[in-house]
């Protein structure tokens, strides 16, 4: 089996963690988040070729069926395997609060 | 906000559970699985428009950034939110075993 972390499409083309710089306006948060003003959003982007970072047996099945029926079954997709928490200072009904969100920033990626 | 379960693209077009009939040969399992000979594979297929079955805050972020930078950031993707277990009768070095797999069949779907 091919190494699950070696991208056959060339460096950086397969499913991996990317960082996208975004303002509160970009994120659609300007009306409820006070800080930070900008966020380095980590997200999972890239192709999922056969055997590359397969999350589980379901991902293997999906790839095999995609090769058989590409019009019916899509290829596996690059999504977060886990997340990093982030704190936001946000507006609330009563004022301002500091709140932790556990599902904001991707920590690592796999193909599902 | 739009109902997170109402598909704006028309019935059946958005992220949902589909069943795909597959043989052991289709799945690439013929050399190690004895039974069942055929599987009704449940998997997540469909589009992920804005606010549809968003799994978490990360999915919201991804959609907002996709609208801003469609060439850089892909839209959220339809993946399993949970799985149903399945038992397989499989060949082993010593003979035959009955094995449960927890990550084979999608149970329900969301957009990440």
């Amino acid at each position: 089996a091919r190494n699950g972390d070696r991208c056959p499409l060339g460096p950086g083309r397969c499913c991996r963690l990317h960082t996208v710089h975004a303002s509160l306006e970009d994120l659609g948060w300007a009306d409820w988040v006070l800080s930070p003003r900008e966020v380095q959003v980590t997200m999972c982007i890239g192709a999922c070729p056969s055997q590359f970072r397969e999350a589980n047996m379901h991902a293997q099945i999906k790839m095999n069926l995609h090769r058989l029926k590409p019009d019916t079954v899509p290829a596996p997709c690059c999504v977060p395997a886990s997340y990093n928490p982030m704190v936001l200072i946000q507006k609330t009904d009563t004022g301002v609060s500091l709140q932790t969100y556990d599902d904001l920033l991707a920590k690592d990626c796999h193909c599902v | 906000a739009r109902n997170g379960d109402r598909c704006p693209l028309g019935p059946g077009r958005c992220c949902r559970l589909h069943t795909v009939h597959a043989s052991l040969e289709d799945l690439g399992w013929a050399d190690w699985v004895l039974s069942p000979r055929e599987v009704q594979v449940t998997m997540c297929i469909g589009a992920c428009p804005s606010q549809f079955r968003e799994a978490n805050m990360h999915a919201q972020i991804k959609m907002n950034l996709h609208r801003l930078k469609p060439d850089t950031v892909p839209a959220p993707c339809c993946v399993p939110a949970s799985y149903n277990p399945m038992v397989l009768i499989q060949k082993t070095d010593t003979g035959v075993s009955l094995q449960t797999y927890d990550d084979l069949l999608a149970k329900d779907c969301h957009c990440v």
Epitope: L34, S35, P36, R37, E38, P85, V87, S97, L98 | -
Partner: antibody, heavy 121, light 107 residues
Framework: QVQLVQSGAEVKKPGASVKVSCKAS????????ISWVRQAPGQGLEWMGW????????FYAQKLQGRVTMTTDTSTSTAYMELRSLRSDDTAVYYC??????????????WGQGTLVTVSS | DIQMTQSPSSVSASVGDRVTITCRAS??????LAWYQQKPGKAPKLLIY???SLQSGVPSRFSGSGSGTDFTLTISSLQPEDFATYYC?????????FGGGTKVEIK
């Protein structure tokens, strides 16, 4: 380089008010918040509150609610902290601190030199 | 409010010693903790943020660890300029709170 320069020492009578300024330079003032921290003689650090330099939204420590007001002047990149109805136990060194906020959370990465406020009759 | 308890309140040590200061939060704060050093008559200085990230310009003999409720600041080999008071700070929720401080003194 980032600098926070505070106004000079003050001596006030009980019941009076004091307004301490904190002039920021070396960064985009509206990109980060400002926190105010005080330290009574021989004591530890006490957080007084935070202000967004962008929106001017504030959070004040419960203990100081109704007596403290934090403001900013973006045209001069200056933050202000006013404390009213001063009491002797308000005698302290008052610090402003840039409140850096990113995906690694919050931290007070640059501090003013401190302003000694003495409340005495 | 989240209470931050530091121990010990003071420690006597010699140059070259390994010094460990602990900080306990009254409830879980993930890794949202910072450490500061303060010398007499000076403003505090940021050493560590996000429990274990070293602030730019701070010597690598300083390190932080922990998550949840229990945290540690370690000075691997105490230098003469490290004699000071150290404070932990939770930035998990408002109001932000500091520990009571640990004074590192010359033995």
């Amino acid at each position: 380089q980032v600098q926070l320069v505070q106004s000079g020492a003050e001596v006030k009578k009980p019941g009076a008010s004091v307004k301490v300024s904190c002039k920021a330079s070396g960064y985009t003032f509206t990109n980060e918040g400002i926190s105010w921290v005080r330290q009574a003689p021989g004591q530890g650090l006490e957080w007084m509150g935070w202000i967004s330099a962008y929106t001017a939204d504030t959070f004040y420590a419960q203990k100081l609610q109704g007596r403290v007001t934090m403001t900013t002047d973006t045209s001069t990149s200056t933050a202000y902290m006013e404390l009213r109805s001063l009491r002797s136990d308000d005698t302290a060194v008052y610090y402003c601190a840039r409140t850096r906020h990113d995906t690694s959370g919050l931290r007070f990465d640059y501090w003013g030199q401190g302003t000694l406020v003495t409340v005495s009759s | 409010d989240i209470q931050m308890t530091q121990s010990p309140s003071s420690v006597s040590a010699s140059v070259g010693d390994r010094v460990t200061i602990t900080c306990r939060a009254s409830q879980g704060i993930d890794s949202w903790l910072a450490w500061y050093q303060q010398k007499p008559g000076k403003a505090p200085k940021l050493l560590i943020y996000a429990a274990s990230s070293l602030q730019s310009g701070v010597p690598s003999r300083f390190s932080g660890s922990g998550s949840g409720t229990d945290f540690t600041l370690t000075i691997s080999s105490l230098q003469p300029e490290d004699f000071a008071t150290y404070y932990c700070q939770q930035v998990h929720s408002f109001p932000i709170t500091f520990g009571g401080g640990t004074k590192v003194e010359i033995k």
